[in-house]
């Protein structure tokens, strides 16, 4: 019997009946065994077929077989109900070998020409399986010449049998307080030949509870306990299971914070598996009772390990732990069933005793010493000499712990000295220099420091004076000896003040005329206002109406008198304002340089002379009565004049204060 060619030679060829294409003889038996390489099969088809037809091909036939299986027995020329001829059919070996047997019997009724066939080896596609047959591979099948291989989806690994995909289902750790876990692919069938390990690991103090949910289907056996596939649950205390079959296992209360779930499957079966919903519990903490004027959030039926609550206080109350304020409060339940911090209090906001008001007082309105939320206090200023600036003095204790005015201000009100009060009333006529009486000029300030000069008190910590009077001390403010509240220049009874800083107008040039002859002295402490020490008012916008030509102003000071000496007692003189052009003309002639009198100056005095300010009065105030407010204000600052004070046809020249209101206000607000 001839054999087919041996691989690796090409496996293909031709087969024919003996004597083909002539008729075949009787009593012939011929056998061919064709062999292909592993992973290949043989394909065979006939190009000519002419054999004696007999019932079930008993006489002459060609038989094709592969291994023990007969693929076909062929005879005749065309197929009938009971006999088969190859026609155009192609035949395939089942493995890599194909046996072909030709036989003729002892007689033929007529001549038959036999057969001619061709064969070739071809790759087997192992990945193609007939319907109803098990697939070659669990997941993916890859055919190649001479063979195939299997691969798996993500999350699986190829078993050593090279066909099954085992699930990579170990090492998952669940740390949340509740969750779900299930067999791989649930609710689809779970994979074969897999060993899965799941861990639930919660903080110490928690106890895991397992509930099997939805469905449970694990391969079982009627007599033996879970011999094929099984589920086991292990804690540090005990083991539960194995579980299999179709009945949902009961709830398992593990009383453990760690659980290991093992699921093992064999190579066969088609079951949907299982799903577990797990929860946890722990020793509950005492139910938190909110402190008075507070509330707990969130509200829960019970609080267990890791649960927390916060306390929020009502408006006007603040969290206190002991006496210490807390920004927020959150307590956490511990594993021993206790809270990690003690409950705070919601204590009513206490604004505390209100600050003392300089030159004022405070009165408790709500009740004596009551300083808690919504309490009301009333500030007021010392009558007569102080007045409250901006607000009405009513303050309420607000939720932020601050005393707050009706305008929302948290700063204290200010008791501002009342300005321009004088014991003196003007007679409205000109008369000679007079001795001042107590309270006549309570703004009068005596400035000693090299020379004698004067100034006027503004507010309770500023002195308005002439630049030329303090120019030498501008860099040594502390050298100025400032006295007030006295009439007698040499009296030991006076209120002492010291300078913190001297501010000379930037437009003033020393020894080059007296334009911008104005300065401010900041005192290092506020002075106490009384009938003998009261500030002068600054001019209002409307003040010019009280400072027209011939309106009377009053100058005061300890300057030279007609006798040529500094006055012992404070003196004053009432003098009229002089027409500006008239004054300018008076100082146009020598020895005065042109332009001595500027728009920043005003003049006052008598044309006939005799009433004037003089050396030593420098820096003092020329004051006017504002008849609308009934307050005295400073209209001029004693600046300069003729060499001979009180000279006829010459006038005292004063710095025009109204021109400097913005400058004064800026300095005072900035410093």
């Amino acid at each position: 019997t001839p054999l087919g060619p041996k691989w690796p030679e090409p496996v293909f060829g031709r087969l024919a009946s003996p004597g083909f294409p002539g008729e075949y003889a009787n009593d012939q038996e011929r056998r061919w065994t064709l062999t292909a390489p592993p992973g290949y099969r043989l394909r065979l088809y006939f190009t000519h077929f002419d054999l004696e037809l007999s019932h079930l091909c008993e006489y002459d036939f060609v038989k094709l077989s592969s291994g023990a299986k007969v693929l076909a027995t062929l005879c005749g020329q065309e197929s009938t109900d009971t006999e088969r001829a190859p026609g155009k059919d192609t035949f395939y070996s089942l493995g890599s070998s194909l046996d072909i047997t030709f036989r003729s019997d002892y007689s033929n009724e007529k001549p038959f020409t036999g057969f001619e066939a061709f064969y070739a080896a071809e790759d087997i596609d192992e990945c193609q399986v007939a319907p109803g047959e098990a697939p070659t591979c669990d997941h993916h099948c890859h055919n190649h010449l001479g063979g195939f291989y299997c691969s798996c989806r993500a999350g699986y690994v190829l078993h050593r049998n090279k066909r099954t995909c085992s699930a990579l289902c170990s090492g998952q750790v669940f740390t949340q307080r509740s969750g779900e876990l299930s067999s791989p692919e649930y609710p689809r069938p779970y994979p074969k030949l897999s060993s899965c390990t799941y861990s639930i690991s919660l903080e110490e103090g928690f106890s895991v509870i397992l509930d099997f949910v939805e469905s449970f289907d694990v391969e079982t056996h009627p007599e033996t306990l879970c011999p094929y596939d099984f589920l086991k649950i292990q804690t540090d205390r005990e083991e539960h299971g194995p579980f299999c079959g179709k009945t949902l296992p009961h709830r398992i209360e593990t009383k453990s914070n760690t659980v290991t779930i093992t699921f093992v499957t064999d190579e066969s079966g088609d079951h949907t598996g299982w799903k577990i919903h797990y929860t946890s519990t722990a020793q509950p903490c005492p139910y938190p009772m909110a402190p008075p004027n507070g509330h707990v959030s969130p509200v829960q039926a019970k609080y267990i390990l890791k649960d927390s609550f916060s306390i929020f206080c009502e408006t006007g109350y603040e969290l206190l732990q002991g006496h210490l304020p807390l920004k927020s409060f959150t307590a956490v339940c511990q594993k021993d069933g206790s809270w990690d911090r003690p409950m705070p209090a919601c204590s009513i906001v206490d604004c505390g005793p209100p600050d003392d008001l300089p030159s004022g007082r405070v009165e408790y309105i709500t009740g004596p010493g009551v300083t808690t939320y919504k309490a009301v206090i009333q500030y007021s200023c010392e009558e007569t000499f102080y007045t409250m600036k901006v607000n009405d003095g009513k303050y309420v204790c607000e939720a932020d712990g601050f005393w707050t005015s009706s305008k929302g201000e948290k700063s204290l009100p200010v008791c501002e000295p009342v300005c321009g009060l004088s014991a003196r009333t003007t007679g409205g006529r000109i008369y000679g220099g007079q001795k001042a009486k107590p309270g006549d000029f309570p703004w009068q300030v005596l400035i000693l420091g090299g020379t004698t000069a004067a100034g006027a008190l503004l507010y309770d910590n500023w002195v308005l004076t002439a630049a030329h009077a303090v120019y030498e001390q501008k860099h040594d403010a502390s050298a100025l000896d400032i006295r007030m509240g006295t009439l007698k220049r040499l009296s030991p009874h006076y209120t002492q003040a010291w300078s913190e800083a001297v501010f000379i107008h930037e437009g003033y040039t020393h020894d080059a005329g007296f334009d911008n002859d104005i300065a401010l002295i900041k005192l290092n402490n506020k002075v106490v206002i009384n009938s003998n020490i009261t500030p002068i008012c600054l001019p209002r916008k409307e003040a010019e109406s009280f400072m027209r030509t011939d309106d009377i102003g009053t100058a005061s000071g300890w300057g030279l008198t007609q006798r040529g000496f500094l006055a012992r007692n404070l003196m004053y003189v009432d003098i009229p304002i002089v027409d500006h052009q008239k004054c300018t003309a008076a100082y146009e002639k020598p020895p005065y340089p042109r332009g001595s009198v500027t728009a920043n100056m005003l003049c006052a005095g008598l044309e006939s002379g005799g009433k004037d300010s003089c050396r030593g009065d420098s820096g003092g105030a020329l004051v006017f009565l504002d008849s609308e407010t009934e307050r005295w204000f400073v209209g001029g600052i004693v600046s300069w004049g003729s060499m001979n004070c009180g000279e006829a046809g010459q006038y005292g020249v004063y710095t025009k204060v109204i021109n400097y209101i913005p400058w004064i206000e800026n300095i005072i607000s900035d410093f």
Epitope: H323, P325, K327, D350
Partner: antibody, heavy 118, light 106 residues
Amino acid sequence: QVQLQESGPGLVKPSETLSLTCTVSGGSISSSSYYWGWIRQPPGKGLEWIGSIYYSGSTYYNPSLKSRVTISVDTSKNQFSLKLSSVTAADTAVYYCARDRRGRFDPWGQGTMVTVSS
Amino acid sequence: SYELMQPPSMSVSPGQTASITCSGDKLGDIYAYWYQQKPGQSPVLVIYQDNKRPSGIPERFSGSNSGNTATLTISGTQAMDEADYYCQAWESSTGVFGGGTKLTVL
């Protein structure tokens, strides 16, 4: 305005007990609004809270000093006191008393220097 | 034990803004307090409960506190602001001070 004044010996021997008193004027030590505290400051160094007391006698102490510190109050004299036992040179400091209103120290006393030396 | 960290020193020109920091673990969850101490003088409270200013303290002093850092800000710094500044907080009912920052006004 409330004022505080510390008093006590300026020199203490090692291993002895340091005793200081703080006298409160211009306000009552029995006010429910306040605790009263002690703070110290070693030369050239920072501040260290020692402890605070309420007029009822309730106290808070710095854990690092707790074993050696006693703070007491005498409401009749409007005073509170500090005792620090087993002193060493490390306890040399300016000791301040202060009013403690809900955790904020205001005002403070002028401070008293205590030297620990033999 | 709880610690508050401050830079030992910093300098600022007059009129400029000085920002002094104080850091501690979750400091923003608790209140911070700030004290000013001039040489030879007792400390003075300048800011309490993070951002509140006691009466008598100029408006140029302000405070903030979040995360791990509290900040004292002095805007328009003046020569008189030259001093040591200490932050303070209460942690578990224990008073803790920072090491202090020496502010120099150039």
